[in-house]
């Protein structure tokens, strides 16, 4: 992979109630199905329309699921991870890692259509410029007093 990619990584606890058709999402990953190079983690690959996850609205395609009902998803075979979800009961607590790309370049796991992120300098340069202008205005104001 070329170029540097910056991410804003946040974690969230998502509590889902199993609906009539289940939890309503698909997963990829596992030690026997690496979806992201050098990472055997479990990722959300699809949110089903009108399913429990879609109606809740917080779980997103590309999210990494760290645990289910407190049980770590590290180093699991793909089918073992699937079975863990299927046997998780009616109320399911997911520890999820959201990853937001903030610079153009290759992306770790955002599915088939990689969204182009916001280059970090496009955020920092205006902030820095505003700070400088504010400081200059403040100094001028102080001089006038």
């Amino acid at each position: 992979m070329n170029g540097r990619v910056d991410y804003l990584v946040t974690e969230e606890e998502i509590n889902l109630t199993r609906g009539p058709s289940g939890l309503g999402f698909n997963i990829v990953g596992g030690t026997d199905q690496q979806y992201v190079s050098n990472d055997s983690g479990i990722y959300v690959s699809r949110i089903k329309e009108n399913g429990a996850a879609a109606l809740d609205g917080r779980l997103q395609e590309g999210d990494k699921i760290l645990s289910v009902n407190g049980q770590d998803l590290k180093n699991l075979l793909h089918q073992d991870a699937v079975d863990l979800f299927r046997n998780a009961g009616y109320a399911v607590s997911l520890r999820v890692q959201h990853r937001l790309q903030v610079q153009n370049g290759p992306i770790g796991h955002r599915g088939e259509g990689d969204p182009s992120g916001i280059p970090i300098f496009m955020v920092l340069v205006p902030v820095f410029a505003l700070t400088m202008v504010a400081a200059w205005a403040f100094m001028r104001y102080r001089q006038q007093l």
Partner: nanobody, 126 residues
Framework: QVQLVESGGGPVQAGGSLRLSCAAS????????MAWFRQAPGKEREFVAA???????YYADSVKGRFTISRDNAKNTVYLQMNSLSPEDTAVYYC?????????????????????WGQGTQVTVS
């Protein structure tokens, strides 16, 4: 969004064979669940066969023993080998894909399991 392109359809005599192919786009084809459905004129879309990421296969009772689904992950392609064809197999055959495994109980014959669909290829058995 996965692009699916079917090929291999056409006219065939009863008792004959055809092999359908479905080429898929995407860098993670090996994680896709792939399926074939068919739709005859004036009938509902009908499940034919499916294959999971690890090669597990599922068939409709009407094609068991005659049709074989397979996949080649290196070529991003799924195949449907159809033998002992009869006029009842005449239909437009559609390829379908879902990325990843459902965390709910899997119903291979349910079209809602699949997000992406090809345009179809016509099979006519006379």
């Amino acid at each position: 969004q996965v692009q699916l392109v079917e090929s291999g359809g056409g006219p065939v005599q009863a008792g004959g064979s055809l092999r359908l192919s479905c080429a898929a786009s995407g860098r993670t084809f090996s994680t896709y669940v792939m399926a074939w459905f068919r739709q005859a004129p004036g009938k509902e879309r009908e499940f034919v066969a499916a294959i999971s990421w690890n090669g597990s296969t599922y068939y409709a009772d009407s094609v068991k023993g005659r049709f074989t689904i397979s996949r080649d992950n290196a070529k991003n392609t799924v195949y449907l080998q159809m033998n002992s064809l009869s006029p009842e197999d005449t239909a437009v055959y559609y390829c379908a894909a879902a990325i990843g495994s459902t965390v709910d109980s899997y119903s291979p014959s349910d079209p809602l399991e699949y997000d992406d669909w090809g345009q179809g290829t016509q099979v006519t058995v006379s």
